[in-house]
């Protein structure tokens, strides 16, 4: 059955809730594109590999991104 869609964004719902960086398996930041006009942040949790879309405008999520990038810069030589 073909699907009619205006854009191809992945996130149907978003979360404003803070996420503990230690509980993160993966954090995908998908930039806006011709397929989806907004930035999408998809968190994959260590527990059962659950996936959740995060609100890029949320203060808690912005803090999470800072914490993750700081952690990455520590690891890189």
């Amino acid at each position: 059955v073909p699907l009619s869609r205006t854009v191809r964004c992945t996130c149907i719902s978003i979360s404003n809730q803070p996420v503990n960086p230690r509980s993160l398996e993966k954090l995908e930041i998908i930039p806006a594109s011709q397929f989806c006009p907004r930035v999408e942040i998809i968190a994959t949790m260590k527990k059962k590999g659950e996936k959740r879309c995060l609100n890029p405008e949320s203060k808690a999520i912005k803090n999470l991104l800072k914490a993750v990038s700081k952690e990455r810069s520590k690891r890189s030589p």
Partner: antibody, heavy 120, light 107 residues
Amino acid sequence: QVQLVQSGGGVVQPGRSLRLSCAASGFTFSTYGMHWVRQAPGKGLEWVAVISYDGGTKYYADSVKGRFTISRDNSMKTLYLQMNSLRTEDTAVYYCAKDLGDLPPGLDYWGRGTMVTVSS
Amino acid sequence: SYELTQPPSVSVALGQTATITCGGSSIESKSVHWYQEKPGQAPVLVIYKDSNRPSVIPERFSGSNSGNTATLTIGRAQAGDEADYYCQVWDSSTGVVFGGGTKLTVL
């Protein structure tokens, strides 16, 4: 607690239009996707459409594509389904439902449903 | 398009275990949600993401997903469990997909 109050159903002639509404409360409406699902008399559940939290992404089932339009007003915390060019086979109970919130989409709270009868 | 196949009906003796299946190609690669629908009432989510139970749902309800079959199991079946049960997945090319539904009868 989550509440979804539906309105707008009724009897309508084939080819005419109808708009369903779903007023939401008890959760942050502007961060959740919303769905419409229908059930024809004696039949199973049939998904109709979904709209993303910001209204930017809309998916439709093939059976309603080009005839039905899903929309939302986040300031009013209300979901809509505009149904045009109605057919007898659109006769069903229509449910609005809140998205689960995680990926992949699911439906965790449902309205009580509103009956739409398309008949001449 | 992605399709989900459920048996039209399942019977279980009072107090016994009921098993409802949902078949789909490589369904184990998808997350399956289950809904209970009683006559005249709106559907209720009973299992989400294969095996998770909403807090209001009794522990007697459980789910699993492997290979080409997802399963809803209802332990110690009660008369109040009589209902239609639907499985559901999200498919990237077809959106929300429901199974045809299974009518559970408690004898």
